[in-house]
Every structure is written in structure tokens, then in C-alpha cells.
């Protein structure tokens, strides 16, 4: 019996087609992805093959103005239109709190939404009961397939799930659900979830009875043969893991942003054992036409977005200096504003010992592309912010050793004075440079804001300590020459859309007046 699994993950509100780098589509003839194009390919496969499942491994939420405006209603609407069979909850599905998941998505989705390792307690338990499930048994042709969901246990640190959801260890939570499905004689089981490729592989190895793992969160690109675009494969598709009980378990992921449609064919014997698996992600490029009816629907929903981008988010009573003459040479108040917004967006009261789990932000000055003039009645709009942060990036959470941070700050000024983009703006950090010293030895003081303290204060950076830092995904990926971050980071979790983080902060503050306050000094 043959099953075709079509899968997406980390779409991050790319409902419209995008450029090859998943930013806003500029030249339509070279654009990719989007739900209209995805639907064309899915329908093509559904017509050609008998047993097809369309699955999403989480993080549909967060990433473009679509999510900012529609807050998840767009996800439910277009996933319903594409007739997804199941979705696993990702960490970003909790970005607007539990209510922001329940109302727009859980109550509106016509497909099951899954996670076996999220347990509700207290008053939420009855409110959310039945709206998401640990697993779902789906009829496919004359057979059935069990889909078991899972979500990153780090979600409380990455999003806003509140205090009434407990995120258990994925493997511990999955095993009893798989055992139950086996008892019910469901002998073809897919683990669908959002914990990253390393955890996906562990699930394949450790959870007895799981036949296939369809993952997300780490934006992993797997491919067999010559890759069709710029993404470099992290391994073959499917990636085969030998389980502890000796089975070969295929593990797949489909990069991110709706650029690819994962396509996996599995052959099962009559006992539900995987006999063979093969496939590849399908690049959704312009050779695949956009479905006209879905495209028309997208255009209808777009109207509200155009209106939104000119509405006032808040006011500034000071000039927001985002000029390259400032932000690439010294502390600039636009950099301070953005870093403050980044930290504010990551406030999660961890426990009695920590006032927050993260206190530091770094931001490449070259990523700040425009100032905002306060003399336009102080009005700040989404459109203004899109000029400041035009790249559609995310502000991510990483864990780095102090020694790596020190290297990053040395890199920040290694060729100071040439108006290059690597000069770092900061939050929760006090840095002093001595430019008279040779490159690689210019950082003379580096103090960081404590987290394990009731009254935050600045302490010298410790080389061997592990620190959490918020930074643009561009830096996490080694951009602007920050190779040491990419090479030495100990953990990387993708965060919220950059403009969304700043716009939410401004809306929350209503009136802003960021200052230059001595975060960066030269001796």
C-alpha cells in the first residue's frame, strides 16, 4: 500500500508568492511559493495519485503583514481552502497568546490540529478541550493512518503560551499515544511536529512504532540529487534514521516559507511496516501557475493590508536616527529603539531567580535602512517601519558563549570607519572600544545585563559562560561576516518578524522617545 505525504513547515505567513530569498515578491516572473501556487501543485498530485495526505508541521503564524493584520484568520481560511489534512502546533502559533490561537485558528480550522506533548491545566483545560488533539486517525483510501503531533518543549521561552499549558518532553509524551494507536490496530503512524531536525531524528530513533517523522522548526532543507535553488541540503531526502528497535525510519522537512512542497512516497506492507521511501521537496517556482480562484481570494484579502500599512501605530516625539552615518559609526537611537523592542518582545518571566530569560540584544547597523522624522506629527506607520527594516527578517533567540560574543564585538569594529554594516547596535550591553588598538583587540570593556537577579545591573562578560542573545536571523546565519556566530552558536530558535516586533512595541508604548545613552563608547 502506497502513501503520498505532501508537507510544509515554517510557512510564516507567506501567503503571497515571494522572491527567491522568501522576501517580498518584486519580479513576478521569478517569484516562488504562495498558497495559490501551492494549491495548483497539491491538486495536480491529488488527481494523479490515490492516497495523498497534506500535512503542515507548524509555524504558519508570524512573518509578514498578513499575520499582523489578520492574526491567524488568514491561516485557517487558506489552509481550509487547500484542504490540509492535519497540522501540528508550532511555537509561533502561541505568539498572540492562547486566545490568539483558539479564536482565529483552533475554532475555525476544518482539519485536526495536533500536539501530544502540550497539556492544558487549570481553567484553560475545559476551554481548549477537543480544540487540539494529541493524535488523529485519518482515513486514506481503504486504510487509515495515525498522525501524532508534537511541539517544541522550548515554546514557553520562544512564545507566549501562558501558564496553563505544560510543554512536556516530546519523546515521553509521544510514546503512550503511539502505544494506544498500536493497541487500536492503527499500524501506520506519522509523527508530525515542530521541534527541529535533531529532535525529529531522536523521535525516529526512540519512539517505538513511529513509521515516518515529518518535522519543522529548524528550516532544514533535505534533498537527494542536485538542489534546484540556493538552499544547501543538510542531508538526503528522506533522511533515514535507524530506530533502536532496528527499523529504518524516514525523517523529512521542507525548508520554510512555502518555497517548497515536501513530497514523500512511502510503501507499507500489510502489517504497516515501511518497505520503501523516496521523494524530494518540489520547488514551487514560476513554472507552476498560481491557481486563479485562490489568487483571486488572496487579492480580496490583500485590500485590508494596504489600508493597514498607512495607519498610525504610535508616535515619536524625537527624531529616530536610522541614518547609516550614525548607525554604522556609533550608538544610534533607532538601534536602541529596535533592541529595546526585541528584548520587550522576549519578556517571559522564567521563575523567581530570573527577572527574564534573556537581557541582551545585538543588531547590525547595516540592517537599519532609514530614519523616521518626528516632524510629520510624530506619526509612525507600518510603511515607515518597512523602510527601516525592509528585508523581512526575524529577530531570533540564540545561545552563545561569552567568548563568541567577544569575537563578535571585535568583528564589529575590525575595519571601523568604512561605513560597513557590521557595526553593532546593542541592548543590555555596555561596550567600550579603543580604536587605537589593532583590529581583533579593540574591545576594552564589555559588560552585560544580568538575568539571574532581582535588580538588573551590568557585570563583566564571562568568557566561558553561556548567554542568551536576541539578534536578527541575518546575524545568526553569519551575515555581515559574523561567521563566528554561525559556527559557534549553541542553540538557535527563529523568532518573530522584525517589523512586527517593533510595531507591537510602538503600539504598546504609544509615545516613544529613545535616547543615545552611552551603551556604546569609545575610549
Amino acid at each position: 500500500w502506497e502513501l503520498t505525504i505532501l508537507h510544509t513547515n515554517d510557512v510564516h505567513s507567506r501567503l503571497e508568492q515571494t522572491s527567491e530569498d522568501s522576501s517580498k515578491c518584486v519580479n513576478a516572473s521569478r517569484c516562488m511559493g504562495g498558497v495559490a501556487r501551492l494549491f495548483t501543485k497539491v491538486q495536480q498530485i491529488r488527481r494523479a495519485e490515490p492516497n495523498v495526505l497534506l500535512l503542515d508541521a507548524g509555524d504558519q503564524y508570524q512573518g509578514t503583514i498578513w499575520f499582523t493584520v489578520y492574526k491567524g484568520a488568514e491561516v485557517a481560511h487558506f489552509m481550509n481552502a487547500l484542504r490540509y489534512d492535519a497540522m501540528a502546533l508550532g511555537n509561533h502559533e502561541f505568539d498572540n497568546g492562547v486566545e490568539g490561537l483558539i479564536e482565529p485558528l483552533l475554532k475555525e480550522a476544518k482539519f485536526p490540529i495536533l500536539s501530544a506533548n502540550i497539556k492544558a491545566k487549570g481553567p484553560l483545560a475545559s476551554q481548549i478541550s477537543g480544540l487540539y488533539l494529541p493524535y488523529k486517525v485519518l482515513p486514506v483510501g481503504d486504510e487509515v493512518v495515525g498522525i501524532v503531533g508534537y511541539t517544541s518543549k522550548e515554546t514557553p521561552f520562544l512564545s507566549n503560551p501562558g501558564t496553563n499549558l505544560v510543554f512536556e518532553d516530546e519523546i515521553t509524551a509521544l510514546q503512550p499515544e503511539v502505544d494506544k494507536l498500536k493497541t487500536l490496530n492503527v499500524n501506520k503512524i506519522i509523527a508530525l511536529g515542530h521541534s527541529g531536525f535533531e529532535t525529529d531524528k531522536l523521535i525516529a530513533q526512540k519512539v517505538r512504532g513511529v513509521d515516518v517523522v515529518v518535522g519543522g522548526h529548524s528550516n532544514t532543507f533535505l534533498y537527494t540529487g542536485n538542489p534546484p535553488s540556493k538552499e544547501v541540503p543538510a542531508g538526503k531526502y528522506p533522511f533515514i534514521v535507524t530506530s533502536d528497535d532496528g527499523r529504518k525510519v524516514p525523517v523529512v522537512q521542507a525548508y520554510a516559507f512555502g518555497k517548497y512542497l515536501g513530497y514523500l512516497k512511502i510503501e507499507f506492507d500489510e502489517r504497516g511496516n515501511v518497505i520503501s521511501s523516496h521523494g524530494n521537496p518540489i520547488l514551487l517556482n514560476s513554472s507552476i501557475p498560481e491557481d486563479p480562484s485562490i489568487k483571486a481570494d488572496i487579492n480580496k484579502w490583500r485590500i485590508k493590508l494596504d489600508n493597514y500599512s498607512t495607519q498610525e501605530l504610535g508616535k515619536t516625539i524625537v527624531y529616530l536616527d536610522g541614518s547609516s552615518q550614525s548607525c554604522r559609526f556609533r550608538e544610534c537611537n533607532m538601534g536602541n529603539l529596535i533592541c529595546d523592542a526585541m528584548i520587550n518582545n522576549n519578556l517571559r518571566h522564567a521563575d523567581e531567580m530570573f527577572w527574564n530569560h534573556v537581557s541582551m540584544c545585538i543588531l547590525n547597523g547595516g540592517g537599519i535602512r532609514s530614519p523616521i522624522d518626528e516632524r510629520n506629527n510624530g506619526t509612525i506607520t507600518w510603511e515607515n517601519l518597512a523602510a527601516v527594516l525592509p528585508f523581512g527578517g526575524t529577530f531570533d533567540l540564540v545561545q552563545l558563549k561569552g567568548s563568541t560574543l567577544k569575537k563578535a564585538f571585535e568583528h564589529s569594529v575590525h575595519r571601523y570607519g568604512q561605513s560597513t554594516g557590521e557595526f553593532l547596535q546593542v541592548g543590555g550591553i555596555h561596550v567600550v572600544y579603543d580604536l587605537s588598538r589593532k583590529p581583533g583587540d579593540r574591545v576594552v570593556k564589555l559588560d552585560v545585563l544580568c538575568t539571574k537577579c532581582r535588580v538588573p545591573s551590568y557585570d563583566p562578560l564571562k568568557m566561558d559562560e553561556i548567554y542568551k542573545v536576541i539578534l536578527p536571523n541575518f546575524l545568526a546565519n553569519g551575515g555581515d561576516g559574523f561567521q563566528m556566530i554561525k559556527d559557534e552558536l549553541l542553540r538557535h530558535d527563529s523568532g518573530d518578524q522584525d517589523i512586527n516586533v517593533v510595531s507591537t512595541y510602538i503600539s504598546k508604548m504609544k509615545v516613544i522617545y529613545p535616547a543615545v545613552e552611552g551603551r556604546i563608547k569609545f575610549s
Epitope: P134, V137, P139, K182, T183, V186, G209, E270, R271, G272
Partner: antibody, heavy 117, light 110 residues
Framework: EVQLLESGGGLVQPGGSLRLSCAAS????????YSWVRQAPGKGLEWVSA????????YYADSVKGRFTISRDNSKNTLYLQMNSLRAEDTAVYYC??????????WGRGTLVTVSS | QSVLTQPPSASGTPGQRVTISCSGS????????VNWYQQLPGTAPKLLIY???QRLGGVPDRFSGSKSGTSASLAISGLQSEDEADYYC???????????FGGGTKLTVL
């Protein structure tokens, strides 16, 4: 033809034992989980026991726990129910049932067990 | 006394639509798929509906199932005399770690 055929029912005294068998044909026996379900005269259906397919795990209703044992022999395509310490309230038609997709999808014709002195 | 509650009897005239309800709790219907069986007089039960709303091959489309929260129902439209039988709902119960059957509903076609 796909079928399940029970045997081994009959009259037994309270406290006695009986072993029911269920022979499967027309499909791959080892690929499935199985269950025993009973129906007392004029009453509804009551689940008794189940055995999983791949891992051979067993499950029992509270009313028979410790007295009944479910087992299978894949080489003989046969399911068994060993019933000990029988009581009058165990009197029923016992159905052998195949567990399909999260459901009981195939039933035998049943065998009558009467517990009486 | 079954943990899944069904009305003991239901009736309708030929051509009519009848609905049989099955009420349970979070540990059974709330968390698991519901199946419906038909038992004609003197015969073994026969599966009609599985996974809440999936008709078994060969079952007329007059039979349909649905589930909401901790309740499920079986609807029979265009009632026919051969539909006269006992109908049982069933599901797995997570607490009991076993199958549960409803008490059964005797359907009479008047």
C-alpha cells in the same frame, strides 16, 4: 472468504474453566489485533478483552481481570480466551472480533457459554 | 449500566429520518473515535460507521455519523423496514484502557 469462527462454548459449573478458540481465515491473521466481546441473553454488548497486533499487549475489562486470559497463536491463525473461576454472570454469547482501524471491523458468529449448576 | 448512554428505543415510519444519540465523557468519546454497529435479530453485530463519520464499504449513504465534544450520533434517513435492529455506539476509553459499548438502541420501523 474472510471470517472468524468461535468454538469451545458450552455448559460449565460456577468456579469451573473453559477455553474458547477463534479460527481466522481469508486474511493475514498476524497483521491484526483482536478482541472478545460478550452479550448476555437479552442484553447489550460488553467488551471483555483485547490483544494488540504487533506487540501482543493485553487488556481486560475490570469484570474479568485476573480470571480470563487472552492469547494468540499466529502460526495457527487462532485467538484464545482462557476463562477460569467462572460465575453465573459470565453467561453470554462470546464473540471473537478483529480490531481494524481503531474499530472492531469483523465479528464471528459467537459461541454460547452457560455457567450454571 | 453502560458509561455510554444511548436511548433504549427509537422508532420511525418508512422514509423518515431518525437520529440515535450516544453520550459519554472526555476519557472516551471526548478523546477517541466513535464507531456504530448494527445487530439484526439473531445475528452478530456488523460495523456501519468508523472514525466518527466514515461509512464502511457497502453501507448505504442513508447512514451517517457525527461527533461533537463528548457526544456522537447516528442518523438514518429514508428509513426502511430492513433497518429494524439494535444499534450500538462504541469507543475506546482512556481511563478504563478498554472498549466501551453503549447500552444499545432498539430501532422499530412502524
Amino acid at each position: 472468504e474472510v471470517q472468524l469462527l468461535e468454538s469451545g462454548g458450552g455448559l460449565v459449573q460456577p468456579g469451573g474453566s473453559l477455553r474458547l478458540s477463534c479460527a481466522a481465515s481469508g486474511f493475514t491473521f498476524s497483521s491484526y489485533a483482536y478482541s472478545w466481546v460478550r452479550q448476555a441473553p437479552g442484553k447489550g454488548l460488553e467488551w471483555v478483552s483485547a490483544i494488540s497486533g504487533s506487540w501482543g499487549r493485553t487488556y481486560y475489562a475490570d469484570s474479568v481481570k485476573g480470571r480470563f486470559t487472552i492469547s494468540r497463536d499466529n502460526s495457527k491463525n487462532t485467538l484464545y480466551l482462557q476463562m477460569n473461576s467462572l460465575r453465573a454472570e459470565d453467561t453470554a454469547v462470546y464473540y471473537c472480533a478483529r480490531l481494524g482501524y481503531s474499530t472492531i471491523d469483523l465479528w464471528g458468529r459467537g459461541t454460547l457459554v452457560t455457567v450454571s449448576s | 449500566q453502560s458509561v455510554l448512554t444511548q436511548p433504549p428505543s427509537a422508532s420511525g415510519t418508512p422514509g423518515q429520518r431518525v437520529t440515535i444519540s450516544c453520550s459519554g465523557s472526555l476519557s472516551n468519546i471526548g478523546r477517541n473515535d466513535v464507531n456504530w454497529y448494527q445487530q439484526l435479530p439473531g445475528t452478530a453485530p456488523k460495523l456501519l460507521i468508523y472514525l466518527n463519520n466514515q461509512r464502511l464499504g457497502g453501507v448505504p449513504d442513508r447512514f451517517s455519523g457525527s461527533k461533537s465534544g463528548t457526544s456522537a450520533s447516528l442518523a438514518i434517513s429514508g428509513l426502511q423496514s430492513e433497518d429494524e435492529a439494535d444499534y450500538y455506539c462504541a469507543t475506546w476509553d482512556d481511563s478504563l484502557k478498554g472498549w466501551l459499548f453503549g447500552g444499545g438502541t432498539k430501532l422499530t420501523v412502524l
